[in-house]
Interface confidence: low
């Protein structure tokens, strides 16, 4: 079935060292759990995190990302999850693509985060 | 405004091959794939790949059809071998990316592919 991919519709902002969580849902809601969901950057398409067949693809993630991320699952039956990263670092600022596939149909939505420097208040 | 230019449809015989490929211009992609929708059905993912390289098929079409993508000219090419009437379809290739700081989808006016028997 056909559906939508929706981000948070305003910018994601986090402090540098700490842990940013960007969201991304389908509509209508409906258990994404057998979807391929993916996270990469804009405009080149590094694989941020990538959950395939039940799993996370590790294998597949950009070596900046590596260790730092975790999908948050817990609402992944109702077709929402969220990216964490961990330990933010200035340059994870910028455009993130979120997707989901089902079978043959895929679609994606923007997700922007802003850093900011926690010494400079 | 991206602009779409589609070319490489027509008529082939089952079997046969068939290349499209899809120019897009104004920005750089994030993906490109194309798209097709036969007469009462849904439009459906045929292949479709970010411009990091990574690609996604339709089981339909695997083994078959090959995609690939040029991000610096912005160009994607569908390479369709073995085709079969259920192939039959118009094909549109489809940009997404960020255009003028703005996430934006595009779509192209659609190339027709009709397998013969």
């Known amino acids: 079935g056909q559906f939508r991919v929706i981000g948070p519709g305003h910018p994601i902002r986090a402090l540098v060292g700490d842990e940013a969580e960007l969201p991304c849902r389908i509509s209508p809601g409906k258990n994404a759990t057998g979807m391929e969901v993916g996270w990469y950057r804009s405009p080149f398409s590094r694989v941020v995190h990538l959950y395939r067949n039940g799993k996370d693809q590790d294998a597949e993630q950009a070596p900046e990302y590596r260790g730092r991320t975790e999908l948050l699952k817990e609402s992944i039956g109702e077709g929402k999850v969220a990216l964490r990263i961990q330990n933010v670092r200035f340059s994870d600022e910028g455009g993130y693509t979120c997707f989901f596939r089902d079978h043959s149909y895929q679609e994606e939505a923007a997700v922007e985060l802003k850093v900011e420097d926690p010494f400079y208040w | 405004q991206v602009q779409l230019v589609e070319s490489g449809g027509g008529l082939v015989q089952t079997g046969g091959s068939l290349r499209l490929s899809c120019a897009a211009s104004g920005s750089m992609f994030s993906t490109m794939g194309w798209f097709r929708q036969a007469p009462g059905n849904q439009r459906e993912l045929v292949a479709i790949m970010s411009s990091g390289g990574t690609a996604n098929y339709a089981d339909s079409v695997k083994g078959r059809f090959t995609i690939s993508g040029d991000n610096v000219k912005n160009t994607v090419t569908l390479q369709m071998n073995s085709l079969n009437p259920e192939d039959t379809a118009v094909y549109y290739c489809?940009?997404?990316?960020?255009?003028?700081?703005?996430?934006?989808?595009?779509w192209g006016q659609g190339t027709q592919v009709t397998v013969s028997s």
């Open positions: 489809r940009f997404t990316g960020w255009v003028k700081s703005s996430f934006s989808t595009y």
